[in-house]
């Protein structure tokens, strides 16, 4: 049990106050983290509170400003990037968001040696992506879907690609579906370690069906947004990978990297690229039916002036019980011999663990094992491997950082974080300097987040980088809810849950219950992290009990739980929420006449299906931007878990798992349906179809749309949304305003 200290004693009660909705909407209790921008083994950059860019040297203890806030302000820069030779800085301004990761911006290059902006051969605007080479000060950038190269910032650009075309051909940047569902980045180009080569992806969206929606704006006529967006079963982007020698870019031009034969025989995806050395690259490919992944190691052949990917360097990863990998197929971390690597994949017991691959996957050496999962490999040095896992004390929702000494035999394992601040910190990530000389630990909770700097050899804490003192002080007079993380054992399934309880919680009383659900494949909601958010307010001020439950399909507890939902989304996720609610009722402090459920995105889908389950458990519920039919969602995501919507594959379950099919069952619940009209991700179409089905079934419901808002419902819409949902829930639970 994790109980947040409420610090409430009778004598103090008058000075303590509950959280207000205003606190949440204003971000009054938001926290800060500190991630060093490492530039060497012992140096990092950080943007100070007054916007100076400061270089810190850990070993000398010295710091100095490399770029003043005055220079930043002169071009309204919101971001920066130092060239590896430390001669130039790019300054980013005019940020304009596109999709989840992508944005365009204007870039200025500042010459640190003479304190002036580089004049002549300035960069065009707006640029879709820009980055320095890993060594020196070459620049690669994407403009109007084409890639350009500059040997020096002041040089004229060399155009690498010429076929880029809006919504048709994307070079060096992903199209919508690759950005959102495969790469999770705004870029699709990768420098080799010393900047000799530049690899890039070309996405051809020519044959992809287009989603079109109105953007109302302020004009007399709305404009239409068109996005090539492959829905389940539709034609997918065609991807090709090229590599160009940046020293002699005109010599042989971009050379295509061959696709492994077993992948190329049918529809496929490119999933990631990892440089090993300047002349060795590793590409990962995935069949469209995403249970077979191939890792291909390719070598530069000077005699061919191109890339050779021998079959002997192809490693196949296949899942027989689900899809390949977790949410994504894991990426390899290469060791110093530049051919063997470490990778996370399922072991024979169905738990994701670190394996060492030297020749073949069949002969992989398992490095970690147990009924828990290795989650991320941070760094491999010559003598240590740093990774995170949820092993400690068997809480799947925790993250601790471990070090395995791979230089000695047998390798020994040490938990770096488990006992540092045990009550405060149970969920960590880390950021390592070159050669892991130093690292930063960022603790996200359950207590107030704290970021610290550590010595990479001794693990000794050097200093606190950010401890959120102001937040700690601000919370001193706040009645925070209590939180507990426990588990339910039901029919051989372990359901972990987090319960958020009102500050003066009394087990002998009855409380309204709100279930907050996400429940998507490979997600995790029950995590030991700090948050003061809307549900904290609902518990603190409105006296609700809020519960989050990780059911079947969720991550980091083994393949049995994860792959249980394979090819049948919308069944077990819903069942497990319902099962948990029944268990909560049995605990005796839930008012079973006042139970609600809400969720966003996948959570909106699950909450809708739970409301329409016909159990009579839920009085009301909210779905924000829900998926309503898997035929409406992106191919890459949907097919990973559902297969294809064809008769000879899984069409039947696609049809059976829609929200619309259950329209009649909404008759006895209060349903609030919410969606942004400019949602590029889960299209407004989803809610439009739910609404149509409910109208056709003559079922009453409430709805709210947010004009020109995307999947995030940001800005003023956020305030309106949470205010609206609060009113809805208070009305449902008969709580006075």
């Amino acid at each position: 049990i994790v109980l947040r200290p409420s610090r409430v004693h009778n004598s103090e009660e008058n000075t303590m106050r509950a959280l207000t909705l205003k606190d949440i909407l204003n971000g009054t209790f938001s926290y800060k983290t500190f991630f060093p921008n490492w530039i060497s083994g012992q140096e990092y950059l950080h943007q100070s509170a007054d916007n100076n860019i400061v270089l810190y040297n850990i070993e000398t203890g010295q710091s100095y400003t490399i770029l003043s806030n005055r220079t930043m302000k002169s071009v309204n820069a919101s971001n920066y990037g130092l060239s590896p030779d430390r001669q130039f800085v790019y300054l980013e301004s005019d940020y304009s968001k596109l999709w989840r990761y992508s944005y365009t911006a204007t870039y200025y290059i500042y010459d640190l040696s003479n304190g002036e902006f580089v004049r002549g051969n300035e960069l065009p605007r707006p640029i879709q992506y820009l980055c320095w080479s890993p060594v020196g000060s070459k620049l690669a950038y994407v403009y109007q879907n084409n890639i350009y190269l500059k040997q020096r910032p002041g040089d004229p650009p060399f155009q690498i690609t010429f076929n880029g075309r809006e919504n048709k051909i994307f070079n060096g940047i992903p199209d919508w579906v690759y950005e959102e569902e495969m790469l999770a980045t705004k870029y699709a180009l990768w420098w080799s370690p010393n900047g000799k080569f530049l690899a890039y992806a070309e996405f051809n969206d020519t044959d992809i069906p287009v989603i079109a929606y109105s953007y109302y704006g302020d004009e007399q006529y709305p404009r239409t947004i068109n996005i090539p967006y492959p829905k389940a079963g539709a034609k997918n982007p065609v991807v090709r990978i090229f590599i160009i020698d940046t020293t002699y870019p005109a010599y042989v031009g971009p050379q295509e990297v061959p696709v492994p034969a077993m992948i190329a025989s049918s529809d496929y995806y490119f999933s990631w690229l990892t440089w090993v050395t300047d002349e060795r690259v590793c590409l990962q490919w995935l069949k469209r039916v995403q249970n077979v992944s191939v890792l291909s190691i390719c070598d530069f052949r000077e005699d061919w002036q191109t890339w050779d990917c021998p079959k002997t360097q192809e490693h196949i990863e296949e899942s027989r019980t689900g899809w390949a990998g977790g949410f994504f197929v894991s990426t390899p971390v290469f060791s110093y011999d530049a051919i063997s690597y470490y990778k996370i994949f399922s072991d024979k017991d169905g738990y994701k663990h670190i394996h060492y691959i030297k020749d073949t996957v069949e002969n992989a050496i398992q490095i970690t094992s147990g009924k828990w999962e290795a989650i991320n490999i941070f760094r491999v040095t010559q003598d240590s491997l740093f990774y995170s896992s949820n092993e400690f004390e068997e809480y799947p929702g925790r993250r601790n950082i471990y070090r395995i000494s791979i230089g000695s035999y047998p390798p020994s394992k040490k938990c770096v974080t488990c006992h540092l601040r045990k009550e405060r910190c149970q969920y960590y990530t880390a950021s390592f300097s070159d050669y892991a000389k130093y690292y930063a630990l960022v603790c996200y909770g359950p207590g107030i987040p704290i970021s610290t700097l550590h010595d990479g050899r001794t693990d000794q804490e050097i200093k606190i980088l950010e401890e959120n003192k102001e937040l700690e002080n601000a919370l001193k007079n706040i009645q925070l809810p209590k939180e507990e993380i426990k588990k339910l054992e039901v029919d051989e399934i372990t359901l972990w849950y987090k319960m958020i309880l009102p500050p003066q919680f009394d087990r002998s009383k009855k409380y309204p219950l709100l279930i907050q659900v996400y429940g998507g494949p490979c997600s995790q909601s029950v995590r030991s992290v700090f948050a003061v958010n809307w549900i904290s307010y609902l518990a603190s001020k409105e006296g609700m009990v809020i519960a989050l439950v990780d059911g079947r399909g969720t991550a980091f507890q083994g393949d049995k739980l994860l792959y249980a939902v394979y090819r049948k989304l919308g069944v077990y996720e819903v069942e497990d929420q319902i099962t948990a609610v029944r268990k909560f009722i049995e605990m005796g402090f839930i008012d079973e006449k006042r139970i609600a459920i809400w969720g966003w995105s996948y959570g909106g889908y699950v909450s809708s299906l739970a409301l329409a389950s016909g159990t009579g458990l839920f009085k009301c519920g909210i779905a924000v931007a829900p998926v309503s039919s898997w035929e409406y969602y992106a191919s890459v995501y949907t097919e990973r878990f559902m297969g294809l919507p064809t008769k000879d594959d899984n069409l039947e379950h696609y049809k059976n798992s829609t929200v619309m099919a259950r329209a009649e069952y909404f008759r006895n619940v209060d349903y609030l349906l919410i969606h942004g009209t400019a949602d590029d991700n889960v299209h407004f179409q989803n809610s439009a179809q739910i609404a149509k089905a409910l109208v056709n079934a003559q079922v009453d419901f409430q709805a709210m749309w947010y004009s020109d808002q995307n999947h995030g419902l940001s800005g003023l819409s956020t305030n309106h949304l949470y205010t609206h949902m609060t009113h809805f829930l208070k009305q449902c639970f008969s709580l006075s305003d």
């Epitope: 000077e302 061919w304 990917c309």
Partner: antibody
């Protein structure tokens, strides 16, 4: 036009060394690979190795490793092949050949050959 | 290393006839993009001359009576109508893997 002109014939004693030169013209020397191939009297062709004139990258055939050294002088666009500890079975015509630009391993221009005779 | 075996060792034909020379590799010399097999002609006292590169591409300046085909391990050089100057030794060579290797040669002689 592309030309590779090799040095003249040599007669060497066993145990000695020989250094054959190959002067290139008609193309950008540093952008390409020079291969060395030998042919014993009445026999087939044997690849000895290559040197990339620009990057200096070298690959040798395993059986000659330790006895052969390939170098270039970019100022004179000349490639050299030195073979040490000569034996009688090293008697052969030694050719330099240019690596074809698009051939990916084909040799499109050849020198006229240099006969090296190893005899006591 | 990849061993190339040429057949026949000697081929006796008359001018005007069609010549078919074969080269078999001990393992595949092809990738999804190319077949790394090349053909050369060598006349007595001369250096070899490139005829065909990457299995089927005719080197510039070579008469189009020469053609190459094949993939994987089996390759063929075809001379559609033999001319007197075509009688020579023909070598295949692979560049799929280092070390590069040559076949032992096929001698094409006048019948």
């Amino acid at each position: 036009q592309v030309q590779l002109v090799q040095s003249g014939a040599e007669v060497k004693k066993p145990g000695a060394s020989v250094k054959v030169s190959c002067k290139a013209s008609g193309y950008t020397f540093t952008e390409n690979i020079i291969h060395w191939v030998r042919q014993a009297p009445g026999q087939g062709l044997e690849w000895m190795g290559w040197i990339h004139a620009g990057s200096g990258s070298i690959k040798y055939a395993q059986k000659l490793q330790g006895r052969v050294t390939m170098t270039t002088d970019t100022s004179t666009s000349t490639a050299y092949m030195e073979l040490r500890s000569l034996r009688s079975d090293d008697t052969a015509v030694y050719y330099c050949a240019r690596h074809g630009g698009t051939g990916r391993g084909a040799m499109d221009y050849w020198g006229q050959g240099t006969l090296v005779t190893v005899s006591s | 290393e990849i061993v190339l075996t040429q057949s026949p060792g000697t081929l006796s034909l008359s001018p005007g006839e069609r010549a078919t020379l074969s080269c078999r590799a001990s393992q595949s010399v092809s990738t999804s993009a190319y077949s790394y097999m090349h053909w050369y002609q060598q006349k007595p006292g001369q250096a070899p001359r490139l005829l065909i590169y990457l299995a089927s591409n005719l080197e510039s300046g070579i008469p189009d009576r020469f053609s190459g085909s094949g993939s994987g391990t089996d390759f063929t050089l075809t001379i559609s109508r033999l001319e007197p100057e075509d009688f020579a030794v023909y070598y295949c060579q692979q560049s799929r893997e280092l070390p590069y290797t040559f076949g032992q040669g096929t001698k094409l002689e006048i019948k």
